[in-house]
């Protein structure tokens, strides 16, 4: 298909950074200022993205590639290609419709973005809490209570005996 297209389409060989100009008998013309074409054979150039307001320019637009934006300090990118900027919060907070709010008791957030998540429930793994959680940090689980009981041994248990009638491999 690609070979057929290139034989039929007089525009197929205009290089990136140009467009096939129908107003000039389909010769290749450079992309105008503030536009780009990242692939060859284009009939139009795309308008460069402008990084305004809370967005700032991470990479300038060129004739062959679009501008890339990131967010000004105090904000972070969301979405493909940083399509949105969202306000940062402090660690121990999450962003709500009313702004940054502290994590509720029993939850934490160790980043400037995202939501507060519940502390790990150590008992589900049969472990005990070694270090308590805070708004900024998860709990640290320690060994299970049984591991700490008197007489508990750290000696490795013996290997299970082979079934009768089986010779060593």
């Amino acid at each position: 298909f690609e070979r057929t297209r290139s034989l039929q389409d007089p525009c197929s060989n205009c290089p990136a950074g140009t467009f096939c100009d129908n107003n000039r008998n389909q010769i290749c013309s450079p992309c105008p200022p503030n536009s780009f074409s990242s692939a060859g054979g284009q009939r139009t150039c795309d308008i460069c993205r402008q990084c305004k307001g809370v967005f700032r320019t991470r990479k300038e637009c060129s004739s062959t590639s679009n501008a890339e934006c990131d967010c000004t300090p105090g904000f972070h990118c969301l979405g493909a290609g940083c399509s949105m900027c969202e306000q940062d919060c402090k660690q121990g907070q999450e962003l709500t419709k009313k702004g940054c709010k502290d994590c509720c008791f029993g939850t934490f957030n160790d980043q400037k973005r995202g939501i507060c998540r519940p502390w790990t429930n150590c008992s589900l793994d049969g472990k005990s809490v070694l270090v308590n959680g805070t708004k900024e940090r998860d709990v640290v689980c320690g060994p299970s209570p049984a591991d700490l009981s008197p007489g508990a041994s750290s000696v490795t248990p013996p290997a299970p005996a082979r079934e009768p009638g089986h010779s060593p491999q």
Epitope: L7, P10, N13, C14, P15, Q26, I27, C28, P30, G41
Partner: nanobody
Framework: EVQLLESGGGEVQPGGSLRLSCAAS????????MGWYRQAPGKRREFVAA???????VYAESVKGRFTISRDNAKNTVYLQMSSLRAEDTAVYYC???????????????WGQGTLVTVKP
């Protein structure tokens, strides 16, 4: 406005050489393919050679090994070096600006006025 101005034609003996030039203006020369065509008296215009922006070249079978197409993007000029000329090379030679930077199955967007090459003993 696109302008193509050929020069370098003239009368030459068989086996001789000539270099044709085509000075281009009014468009972005370096990103477009250029070609040379010729029209002998009483015949249809035919493809001779073409060169794309990346300097890939294509030649008609009848001129392969004898003619060389080249370009100077700094001077916006395309050249046709012709050697081992024969009587059958007699024609008006036209410079063409090719559509879409294509040298395979090329089609011409703009023509020059032509320059006459005559090969005779």
């Amino acid at each position: 406005e696109v302008q193509l101005l050929e020069s370098g034609g003239g009368e030459v003996q068989p086996g001789g050489s000539l270099r044709l030039s085509c000075a281009a203006s009014g468009f972005s020369f370096s990103i477009n393919a250029m070609g040379w065509y010729r029209q002998a008296p009483g015949k249809r215009r035919e493809f001779v050679a073409a060169i794309e922006s990346g300097r890939n070249t294509v030649y008609a079978e009848s001129v392969k090994g004898r003619f060389t197409i080249s370009r100077d993007n700094a001077k916006n000029t395309v050249y046709l070096q012709m050697s081992s000329l024969r009587a059958e090379d007699t024609a008006v030679y036209y410079c063409g600006l090719l559509k879409g930077n294509r040298v395979v199955s090329p089609s011409v967007a703009y023509w020059g006025q032509g320059t006459l090459v005559t090969v005779k003993p």
